[in-house]
């Protein structure tokens, strides 16, 4: 049965931010997992895509992601299907809108002492709370004949008088964030002496070193005064300009012109109109310097013919918002057809091989233009250049099996031996072109081989047999150095195998014939009685018709095997006295003697002052201590053989002499006295 280890759960999400609907499945066999949105399968895009079994959102969209999501796991073999619990997003968002006149129906109907209602068209979820501003100053409920209905987003002025004239704006904030009105409303209630806005400055975005113009006009009777201020409250006039506004000009009609705009000129400009009576009207506009960031790199994409694919171009951050378009081969893509642009996406429907190539996403605004290329490869199913062939390979030599294919992109080749994937190791190597090399062919390599060549578009495979031809070889190879015991019978075997049974013969390396007491019997060299003259170099030659001959060289040494002339005896020594363990061996070549004590070889160069090994092989230990007790092994060895003999050493406390004992009394046990 299919079991959900993790189910998707409904959750809060923020518009344009990341989100993840988790889904994890456990099943006895392979299952494939997909997602439904309101019952319809979810297609992967760069914004919303499967990540493992889970569904990942790069940027939540309140319109496209509203509805019920469900994770579905299906076993394509059994047809069993399991569906997770439903999950949906509570998407939090806020969106700016204009301030509009709700009552009366038109601006022309606004008269002093009438009721005026303005509405703030900022919307969001959860419902935001609203704040109203007149000429940039916050309005609090109940002050100066106005009421704010947050529920209806309305500002009511009852009655409206000249003192209410001004630029009305609103801002709203919620758990998601904050937004301010995209277009403000200028309320003008005539009091001839009050300054009234005729033309309000607008926010301006300009490219560096371009010019910016702010228009500002007030009317009143008598005419009002007009003054421009930059951020730090520094007045701007044609006679006194701040150092960083040297290129500012104020025209008679109130317009402010800035030429060769630099970053330091960016900021808030205030236009202040003052009538004979009434409050000053302060209008604000911001000068933004246009900017455009770099675009992120595209990963190369590999698509299969006949499919539909989309590539999303995420526009770079910029001011103003950059416009985006796609080009291919220098031509802008249309908004419909088989290969077209939809929003920021490049859409390729029913992909053809000819669609492969470089596509360019362009983004541009006042600050300039950015572009980023994406390389699209249309994958093709591999085709054969050379299939693997049934082959006879020689044992011990390298063997090659071809698997040459062509496709776009370059195909991946894997090899199987006895239906098991070959992993590259010291014996098997797969070349870039797909050829398999068996570094040193063994008889076990005689079996089935199969190669598979794949691209995302599909795969092809072919198999071939390998038959291994046995090489001519010694089984086993004779030891290159061997010893024979002087005056004894000895045999030196030599055997070989090949595709045909080889004949085997021995000869002396110098080419001389074997003496009559030495026989060569089917590859075994037999010495009836070894003499000193039998030492030397011999060659075993194995040969057959089809494979020629092979040779093995053996150096025979004649030796007198080791015997012990003197062996160490079981020895007991008083603590603090000296122990002598004697050992003498004879043989030819003359044996060397080594001692082993307490399970380690006693290195003559590292014995310390208490121990010494004599030329004749005897071991002496001075000032013995209880820890010197144990088994000591005398090892005699030469180039032909090795023998050992051992004896225990006991270290005992010296007894305290009793009154009755005379000076000549013998010790209670046999020991060395020093």
């Amino acid at each position: 049965a299919i079991v959900f280890i993790k189910q998707p759960s409904s959750q809060d999400a923020l518009q344009g931010r990341r989100a993840l609907l988790r889904c994890e499945v456990e099943a006895p066999g392979p299952v494939h997992v997909y997602w439904l949105l309101d019952g319809a399968p979810v297609q992967d895009t760069e914004r919303r895509f499967a990540q493992g079994s889970s569904l990942s959102f790069a940027a939540v969209d309140r319109l496209q992601d509203s509805g019920t999501f469900q994770c579905v796991a299906r076993d394509d073999v059994t047809g069993e299907e399991a569906r997770s619990a439903n999950a949906s997003f509570n998407i939090k968002w806020i969106e700016a809108g204009p301030v509009v006149l709700k009552h009366p129906a038109s601006e022309a109907e606004i008269q002093p002492q009438t009721q005026v209602t303005l509405r703030c068209h900022i919307d969001g979820h959860p419902r935001p709370t609203y704040q109203w501003f007149r000429d940039g100053t916050p309005l609090s409920d109940g002050q100066s004949n106005h009421t704010v209905s947050s529920k209806e987003r309305n500002l009511t002025l009852r009655p409206a008088g000249p003192e209410h004239s001004g630029l009305y704006s609103c801002c709203a904030h919620s758990a998601f964030g904050q937004a301010c009105s995209s277009q403000n409303f200028t309320l003008s209630i005539a009091d001839e002496s009050f300054a009234r806005v005729v033309l309000a400055p607008q926010d301006v975005v300009v490219a560096r070193y371009e010019e910016a113009m702010f228009h500002c006009q007030f009317s009143a009777q008598p005419p009002p005064s007009l003054q421009w201020l930059f951020e730090d409250e520094t007045p701007i006039t044609n006679r006194s300009r701040p150092p960083h506004l040297r290129r500012a000009t104020v025209f008679a009609n109130g317009s402010l012109l800035l030429t060769q705009v630099r970053p330091r000129n960016a900021g808030i400009y205030r236009c202040i109109g003052q009538g004979q009576r009434g409050p000053p009207i302060i209008l604000e506009a911001t000068l933004h310097l246009a900017e455009i960031e770099d675009m992120p790199l595209f990963e190369p994409r590999v698509f299969t013919a006949g499919s539909e694919e989309r590539v999303t171009c995420l526009p770079p951050k910029g001011l103003p918002e950059p416009s985006v378009w796609w080009e291919h081969a220098g031509v802008r893509l249309p908004t419909h057809g088989r290969v077209y642009q939809k929003g920021h996406e490049l859409v390729l429907a029913n992909i053809a091989e000819s669609d492969a190539g470089v596509y360019t996403c362009h983004a541009a605004n006042l600050a300039g233009q950015r572009r980023q290329d994406v390389n699209i490869t249309v994958a093709t199913v591999p085709s054969w250049l050379k299939k693997p062939q049934d082959s006879q390979l020689e044992e011990g030599k390298p063997g090659y099996l071809d698997c040459l294919t062509q496709a776009t992109p370059k195909p991946t080749v894997v090899w199987y031996r006895n239906q098991m994937l070959i992993s590259e190791d010291s014996r098997f190597e797969v070349f870039k072109n797909g050829t398999l090399r068996i570094n040193s062919v063994e008889v076990y390599d005689g079996t089935w081989y199969r190669c598979m060549s794949s691209t995302p578009a599909g795969s092809i495979e072919a198999q071939a047999r390998v038959q291994v031809l046995e090489k001519l070889k010694f089984t086993p190879p004779p030891q290159p150095q061997q010893c024979m015991e002087f005056d004894k019978e000895a045999t030196v075997p030599c055997s070989a195998t090949g595709r045909e049974k080889p004949t085997i013969k021995w000869e002396r390396a110098d080419g001389s014939s074997l003496p009559e007491w030495v026989t060569d019997n089917a590859g075994t060299l037999h010495f009836a009685r070894v003499t000193r003259d039998d030492a030397g170099n011999y060659t075993c030659i194995a040969s057959n018709g089809p494979q020629g001959q092979i040779r093995a060289h053996v150096q025979l040494t004649v030796a007198v095997f080791i015997t012990f002339k003197v062996e160490p005896e079981r020895t007991t020594v008083y603590q603090g006295h000296t122990a002598l363990l004697q050992c003498e061996a004879q043989g030819d070549p003359k044996p060397l003697i080594q001692w082993k004590g307490k399970d380690r070889i006693l290195d003559p160069t590292k014995l310390g002052p208490r121990m010494h090994i004599f030329q004749n092989g005897s071991l002496v230990i001075h000032d013995v201590a209880p820890e010197d007790s144990g088994r000591y092994t005398c090892i005699a060895g030469n180039s032909c053989n090795i023998k050992h003999t051992e004896a225990p050493l006991y270290v005992v406390d010296k007894p305290v002499p009793e009154e009755s004992e005379g000076p000549g009394s013998p010790p209670p046990y046999k020991m060395i006295q020093t």
């Epitope: 049934d390 006879q392 006895n418 239906q419 098991m420 008889v443 076990y444 390599d445 005689g446 079996t447 047999r465 038959q467 291994v468 031809l469 595709r499 045909e500």
Partner: antibody
């Protein structure tokens, strides 16, 4: 040196299932050998039944494929033959054999299975 | 299935004789041919593999040759222990098939 030893009942009833096991010694069943079954009806020639590799891949004689199952037990170092719906014509000496390089270099001594009621 | 036909079906010879057994495949099998020797009440024993390669431990008087569809097994000088039934087998395609056998008897 690989040695093979067949075991199983010598008498099977018609329409029953013949079950034989081949114990492998002197080598591992996970080596590069293919492990085969061959049979020889009394006084007749040799007939190849099928083969298995330690990974579980099998090849069967199409004439017997619908009735044959060969399996491998790595933990016991043995492989088995099951032949269902047997008839008198399935009476034979059954050999297990193995090899590599496209030959059968190692054989068991064979076991006679008689199909009779 | 590939049919393997051996000839002769039986043959009488004396110790020291040279004998030849032939095996023909119904379609080409390259060199995927093996020869086996079977004595009464015994399991078959591999003599030759890959048409001409001598199995380890087999005397050199046994020799195999041929490729494609026609193959021969030659025993150069018969020994008493060589009297037995000989089978050829193809391992080129499944099912692997044996010849019907050649019985070599003492004259």
């Amino acid at each position: 040196q690989v040695q093979l030893q067949e075991s199983g009942p010598g008498l099977v009833k018609p329409s029953g299932t013949l079950s034989l096991t081949c114990a492998v010694s002197g080598g591992s069943i996970s080596s590069d050998h293919w492990w085969s079954w061959v049979r020889q009806p009394p006084g007749k020639g040799l007939e190849w039944i099928g083969e298995i590799f330690h990974s579980g891949n099998t090849n069967y004689n199409p004439s017997l494929k619908s009735r044959v199952t060969i399996s491998v037990d790595k933990s016991k170092n043995q492989f088995s033959l099951k032949l269902s719906s047997v008839a008198a014509a399935d009476t034979a000496v059954y050999y297990c054999a193995s090899g590599y390089n496209w030959n059968l270099g190692y054989w068991g001594q064979g076991t006679l299975v008689t199909v009779s009621s | 299935d590939i049919q393997m036909t051996q000839s002769p079906s039986s043959l009488s010879a004396s110790v020291g004789d040279r004998v030849t057994i032939t095996c023909r495949a119904s379609q080409t099998i390259s060199s995927y041919l093996n020869w086996y020797q079977q004595k009464p009440e015994k399991a078959p024993k591999l003599l030759i593999y890959a048409a001409s390669s001598l199995q380890r431990g087999v005397p050199s008087r046994f020799r195999g040759s041929g490729s494609g569809t026609d193959f021969t097994l030659t025993v150069s000088s018969l020994q008493p222990e060589d009297f037995a039934t000989y089978y050829c087998q193809q391992s080129y395609s499944i099912p692997y098939t044996f010849g019907q056998g050649t019985k070599l008897e003492i004259k």
